[in-house]
């Protein structure tokens, strides 16, 4: 059939909860392409009916929820004007009850379910939740050894759990939990994460570089919506946190009640030698009190700010 085969690494997943996999393979999927999902070399495509437990949602295959019998090799076929690629994804489903210690250890989990905290540093864990836009995720709760995490050293920020002054006691088994809503139905997502610790700096003490902003002011009209990106380059296995603060407080905490100013979800692009991270700040409505206040982007020890400024009056 003239399609080039590409084999992705195995994904190991937990039964009885939602799972989604996006068929993206840059640069193949960057142009005008059609994507079709199949299971186990079947000639019949995966359903696109949103009521189906397993269905294709744009470029994604979505399981609501995943079941033990869903293990197998799935193919997505990406057809462009002059090209065809078939991507093979091996999904292995296992039954795991995170808090049942009588059940043996986990299988060889994907790397995102194994994370490392750096002793004595401020660090973070990430809850990897990859779902299409049709899935709405609620706030994330974090657990350690099956107990909900509380305490002033821990802060939940979007999909991350910030851990300040990491200690040896922070190692162990964690889980992040969110409620996913799709077509009016709710599902629980629970990701287990094994967390180990190290004293190694890992990234050699490198300092992240904030590309933008550059400690400058931005002219913006009162009442408008404003989104500002903070772009940071850093080494691949850095442990630096990236966030927006005002008055030395995380913006999501500072505007906790009104939610008028929020930090966006961090994204990153991976290059050979470094990563480029983007985390934005959204002003739903700029108010007078926002002017003249430094909004700080933090990335490890690096900081840069923007100051909102009223546009100069136009006397023309």
């Amino acid at each position: 059939d003239g399609c080039k085969d590409i084999f992705m690494k195995n994904e190991i997943l937990s039964a009885s909860q939602p799972f989604a996999f996006n068929c993206t393979f840059p640069p193949i999927t960057s142009g005008e392409v059609s994507v079709t999902w199949y299971k186990n070399s079947s000639k019949i495509p995966v359903s696109k009916i949103i009521q189906s437990r397993i269905h294709q949602d744009e470029t994604w295959i979505l399981f609501l929820p995943m079941e033990w019998g869903d293990s197998g090799v799935y193919q997505c076929v990406i057809k462009g004007r002059d090209s065809c690629h078939r991507i093979h994804v091996n999904l292995t489903v296992f039954e795991k009850h995170w808090c049942d210690t009588s059940i043996g250890g986990l299988p060889n989990l994907s790397d995102e379910y194994k994370q490392i905290l750096h002793l004595g540093k401020d660090d973070s864990l990430t809850c990897h939740l990859h779902f299409p836009k049709s899935c709405v995720l609620g706030p994330i709760k974090w657990y350690k050894d099956c107990n909900e995490i509380k305490g002033e050293r821990f802060t939940v920020l979007e999909t991350r759990l910030l851990v300040s002054n990491v200690s040896a006691e922070d190692r162990g088994n964690y889980a992040c939990q969110a409620i996913l809503t799709h077509s009016g139905k709710q599902y629980e997502v629970l990701n287990g994460i094994t967390v180990s610790i190290t004293e190694r700096a890992g990234y050699g003490g490198s300092v992240p570089k904030i590309i933008y902003p550059k400690n400058h002011s931005i002219e913006v009209q009162l009442g408008t919506t404003l989104i500002v990106d903070c772009n940071v380059t850093d080494t691949k296995d850095n442990t630096n946190l990236r966030c927006w603060r005002v008055n030395n407080t995380l913006v999501d905490d500072y505007y906790d009640e009104s939610k008028r100013i929020r930090e966006g979800v961090e994204t990153h692009v991976s290059f050979r030698e470094h990563n480029l991270y983007t985390v934005n700040i959204t002003f739903l409505e700029v108010k007078m009190e926002d002017y003249g206040l430094p909004f700080m982007c933090h990335a490890g020890v690096s900081t840069a700010y923007i100051i909102l400024q009223l546009p100069a009056p136009d006397f023309r």
């Epitope: 190692r171 610790i197 004293e199 190694r200």
Partner: antibody, heavy 120, light 106 residues
């Protein structure tokens, strides 16, 4: 059970490059830290360096100009190259990894070691 | 670099003796790791995070210390304990080992 196995020539000529490979089973080298350590005859242990889960490498500054650690994730192997060797590089070379009790720095799993002699 | 100095360098002792090996760091370290090595064998993790015994290590071994001074203690020496012991730190690179303490039968 994690197992590590060193392989490579046991004899290297002075000024040449020492090359060793560590083959890993029971764990993926895309998690954790993968270390090289050597033991000079009748002397102590010397830390050479590591390659991390992301491919980041760290080298002991005393060897940095001569050492390269790399990996092949498809074969689940990582390698050591030490250039311009002299008799002082004669040692038993070990690969090792940690992760014991969720502590990456606790080197619990070791290869059996391979003796490399530098001699003409 | 943090220099790790073990004392004594060698020690002759008898079965049943209480033995203490000291590791002094030239600067503060957060945790100490100890390894046991027997001739012709790879080192074995013995004590991690200063005071935790690795799997299979007898309870007669203990580890303690903080800052620049750390100790490995054997409460009652047994024949299988005769070996060389190394301390190691990861607080500051390079990740240095002590020169080793060789424990011999008197």
């Amino acid at each position: 059970q994690v197992q590590l196995q060193e392989s490579g020539p046991g004899l290297v000529k002075p000024s040449q490059t020492l090359s060793l490979t560590c083959t890993v089973s029971g764990a993926s080298i895309t998690s954790g830290y993968w270390n090289w350590i050597r033991n000079h005859p009748g002397k102590g242990l010397e830390y050479i360096g590591y390659i991390s889960y992301s491919g980041y490498t760290y080298y002991n500054p005393s060897l940095k100009s001569r050492v390269t650690i790399s990996r092949d994730t498809s074969k689940n192997q990582f390698s050591l190259k030490l250039s311009s060797v002299t008799a002082a590089d004669t040692a038993v070379y070990y690969c090792a990894t940690g992760g014991y009790d969720y502590v990456e720095d606790a080197l619990y799993y070791w290869g059996q070691g391979t003796l490399v002699t530098v001699s003409s | 670099d943090i220099q790790m100095t073990q004392s004594p360098s060698s020690l002759s002792a008898s079965v049943g003796d209480r033995v203490t090996i000291t590791c002094r760091a030239s600067s503060n370290v957060r945790y100490m790791y100890w390894y046991q090595q027997k001739p012709g064998k790879a080192p074995k993790l013995w004590i991690y995070l200063t005071s935790n015994l690795a799997s299979g290590v007898p309870s007669r071994f203990s580890g303690s210390g903080s800052g620049t001074s750390y100790t490995l203690t054997i409460s009652s020496l047994q024949p299988e304990d005769f070996a060389t012991y190394y301390c190691q730190q990861y607080t500051t690179s390079p990740y240095t080992f002590g020169q080793g303490t060789k424990l011999e039968i008197k």
